[in-house]
């Protein structure tokens, strides 16, 4: 007997798809050897149709796939657009030749069934409504009307015009006539279930003069759509259940052997396993919605179903849509940290991978919010201004060609804890989820700036120092000036007499920034940071206020500004010198063309906006000389 196992008989109808799973013994050799699907000929030869080596025959071109799942010791052959010519004997097997280990599979593809001329065929999906049309002659206009269901030789009444309704059709079947029609009546059966399928007879009148019509009702269970996604990538379930359930609660559930466990619904239920990485978005007023899951894990593979019911839970007789999700562990998406830890007052540098082939794509960072069905408002992007409340403490550093960009958030508070998403306007699979955990600081920060009360006077020289511990000795130190489109690293002191300069006293582990002479436009947030090549590390921020020599009061109270930097950045609204219209951003509409769940960072187009090139002031280094 063969150690390979699969379905011995597969039957379907023309136009359908089949998905044939073959099981093999769990050995290293089996996991890695060639898998094949071949058709048995009369001469005993088995002609390969598709194999895991990449071979695909002409007759399967564009309609078949073979996917190996070594972690399950299975491989799956998917064949679409079946025709009667596909009927035959096949083998699924393992080995370098088609004579190795195999299992015989018989595939039978039938024509769509035909019925006698007087039979009307109704094909409906589970949960939908069917309207059966029953014609009669004028002589039976005032006679009793009925619909019965054939069970063997008997025909059991479902509903009649005397208001009788079979208990199993209670609240689901109605018999009615439309307008002034005198020769036709209708029966509606709603919330169809599989057992409703069968042959129905509608009748007007009694005895030999009765008018009868045959109706064959086929109730289709959902054919799962197959989705193949990489580990750590994202998947979107697009659910279109129809207008009749537009006002009912929607859900996505994951099937187990007994039932279907709700992952998310529009009544606020959400499975903790998907916290921070799921969004449910209504698409329109016709019952369409989508569910996006990011950061796919091996255990996310399985059967999913979306549906609608006032309870937000799966119910028999309500419309559903089904998917089977496969998660490929050989992923192109690199493994990145899923949890990043920080302390209050400190900073985090989060590395976001993206498809290296799309280095010119726009990069974004959003904050996942649990309210309602989940949403993710964009906080920063390569062409999106930093959101209010994050000024001076958030920047995105693009590193073209590296396949990653870095987001730095400093002046951390415990309220920054939560889930964040890295995303681009390119390959939607490359969405990563990071959980940021901010704990109360128990020691002084690694980087400290003096003076903390930073007020510079126009026309004078102003120096500010950043103290760093010895552990950062070998790392590059830099100062950058924060602006709404990034933090531009300041050139070294020999870049020009007027420009800001950086110098470093190694013996006392200090990196200093000098503004000489101070100008009004020098006012703003400055960051001191460390990095190693493209890898960014700790940062700290300070607000430098600029005042006139003649005026006693600075533009902004520097004590308040830097208290915010150290203590409570979420509490204090900072007066900004940036023009009001620069606080609006307009994201590229391609980014979320059909995914409105990720909120736009602004709503007003900004004219003549230069693209943000955070962290690259003309490629100049901020390190000391």
């Amino acid at each position: 007997q063969s150690p390979i196992f699969g379905p011995q008989d597969v039957s379907s109808i023309e136009g359908n798809s089949v998905s044939i799973t073959c099981y093999y013994p769990d050995t290293s050799v089996n996991r890695h050897t060639r898998k094949y699907w071949c058709r048995q000929g009369a001469n005993g030869y088995c002609a390969t149709l598709i194999s895991s080596n990449g071979y695909l025959s002409k007759e399967y071109s564009g309609r078949a796939s073979l996917i190996n799942f070594p972690e399950n010791s299975t491989f799956v052959i998917n064949i679409a657009h079946l025709t009667q010519e596909d009927t035959g004997s096949y083998k699924c097997g393992l080995g370098t030749t088609n004579r190795g280990l195999f299992f015989d599979v018989s595939l039978e593809v039938s024509q769509v069934p035909e019925f006698p001329n007087d039979t009307h065929v109704y094909t409906k999906d589970i949960g939908r409504t069917v309207t059966i049309e029953c014609r009669f002659k004028e002589g039976n206009a005032h006679s009793k009307k009925s619909l019965c269901k054939k069970r063997g030789e008997a025909c059991e009444v479902v509903i009649d015009s005397t208001e009788y309704v079979d208990p199993s059709y209670k609240d689901r079947a109605i018999l009615f006539m439309k307008g002034t029609s005198r020769d036709i009546f209708y029966v509606n059966i709603s919330h169809l279930i599989p057992s409703d399928a069968g042959l129905y007879v509608c009748q007007a009148g009694e005895g030999p003069s009765a008018d009868k019509n045959n109706a064959d009702l086929q109730v289709l269970e959902p054919e799962p759509e197959l989705l193949y996604k990489d580990l750590r990538s994202s998947v979107t379930f697009e659910c279109d259940l129809g207008r009749e359930v537009a006002n009912d609660a929607k859900y996505l559930c994951r099937k187990n052997k007994e039932t279907c466990d709700v992952i998310i619904n529009t009544l606020g239920k959400r499975d903790p396993a998907f916290e921070g990485r799921i969004l449910l978005t209504p698409r329109d007023d016709n019952g369409r919605f989508s569910v996006l899951i990011t950061g796919l894990r091996k255990e996310d593979a399985g059967h999913y179903q979306c549906g609608a019911h006032s309870s937000g839970l799966p119910q028999e007789g309500w419309p559903v849509q089904a998917w089977q999700l496969f998660v490929n562990e050989e992923s192109t998406i690199p493994n990145s940290r899923s949890v990043v830890k920080g302390v209050t007052g400190g900073s985090v540098a989060i590395v976001c991978p993206y498809n290296p082939k799309e280095s010119s794509s726009l990069k974004y960072w959003c904050h996942w919010e649990a309210d309602e069905n989940g949403r993710c408002p964009v906080l920063v992007g390569t062409q999106a201004l930093v959101q209010e409340g994050y000024e001076g403490r958030l920047a995105l550093f693009d590193q073209p060609g590296s396949g990653a960009y870095t987001v730095i958030l400093n002046q951390l508070t415990t309220q920054d804890s939560g889930f964040y998403w890295c995303l681009t306007d390119g390959d939607s699979r490359w969405r990563t989820t990071i959980e940021l955990q901010v704990a109360e600081a128990t020691k002084k920060p690694d980087l400290e700036v003096t003076p903390q009360n930073a007020t510079a006077v126009i026309g004078e020289t102003f120096t500010i120092s950043c103290h760093y511990p010895c552990k950062f000795y070998s790392q590059e130190k830099y100062w950058c000036k924060w602006s709404n489109d990034g933090c531009h690293i300041l050139p070294s002191h020999d870049e020009g007499a007027r420009q800001s300069s950086v110098s470093c006293d190694q013996s006392s582990q200090i990196v200093s920034m000098t503004l000489n002479p101070v100008k009004k436009e020098d006012e703003g947030w400055y960051w001191c940071g460390v990095k190693e090549g493209q890898v960014y590390g700790e940062t700290t921020a300070i607000y430098v206020a600029v005042e006139e020599r003649t005026r006693g009061s600075p533009h902004i109270n520097p004590t308040d500004a830097n208290a915010r930097a150290k203590d409570a950045p979420e509490e204090e609204a900072m007066e900004s010198s940036v023009r009001e219209d620069e606080n609006k951003a307009n994201l590229d509409p391609r980014l979320f063309a059909d995914e409105r769940e990720i909120q736009n960072a602004g709503d007003q187009a900004q004219e003549n906006r230069a693209s943000g090139n955070a962290g690259s002031a003309g490629g100049q280094s901020g390190s000391s000389k």
Epitope: F5, P7, Q8, D9, V10, S11, S12, I13, N16, S17, V18, S19, I20, Y23, I126, P194, Q218, L220, E221, P222, E223, P224, K255, N256, K257, E258, T259, C260, G302, H303, P314, Q315, E316
Partner: nanobody
């Protein structure tokens, strides 16, 4: 909760046929696979046959020892699955159990099935 009721068991001669039925009721969620397992005295319960459906496509799985002799089928309208057993042998004597699941992983695995019937006795005398 799904209830499964088996019927059709009995005492037959070797070489005879029997048809087992399994009726499902009380279902609140569609099942997608129903199958038959058997347990002979002093032995472990073993897989016999399973039928899985997806839309208008059906997949039938059989254990090696019944291939060509047993046929599994279903009547969608009646929520019933049948096991037609031909050319019965004395070694087919066992209690036959019906099982159902909404999600089929490996059809041969007992733990893939959520619901079980009480069983029906099949005795084949020589």
């Amino acid at each position: 909760e799904v209830q499964l009721v088996e019927s059709g068991g009995g005492l037959v001669q070797a070489g005879d046929s029997l048809r087992l039925s399994c009726a499902a009721s009380g279902r609140t969620f569609p099942t997608y696979a129903m199958g038959w397992f058997r347990q002979a005295p002093g032995k472990e319960r073993e897989f016999v046959a399973t039928i899985r459906w997806s839309g208008s496509t059906q997949y039938k799985y059989y254990a090696d020892f019944v291939k060509g002799r047993f046929t599994i089928s279903r009547d969608n309208a009646k929520n019933t699955v049948y096991l037609q057993m031909d050319s019965l042998k004395p070694e087919d004597t066992a209690v036959y159990y019906c099982a159902a699941t909404t999600l089929l992983t490996d059809p041969r695995a007992l733990n893939a099935y959520a619901y079980w019937g009480q069983g029906t006795q099949v005795t084949v005398s020589s």
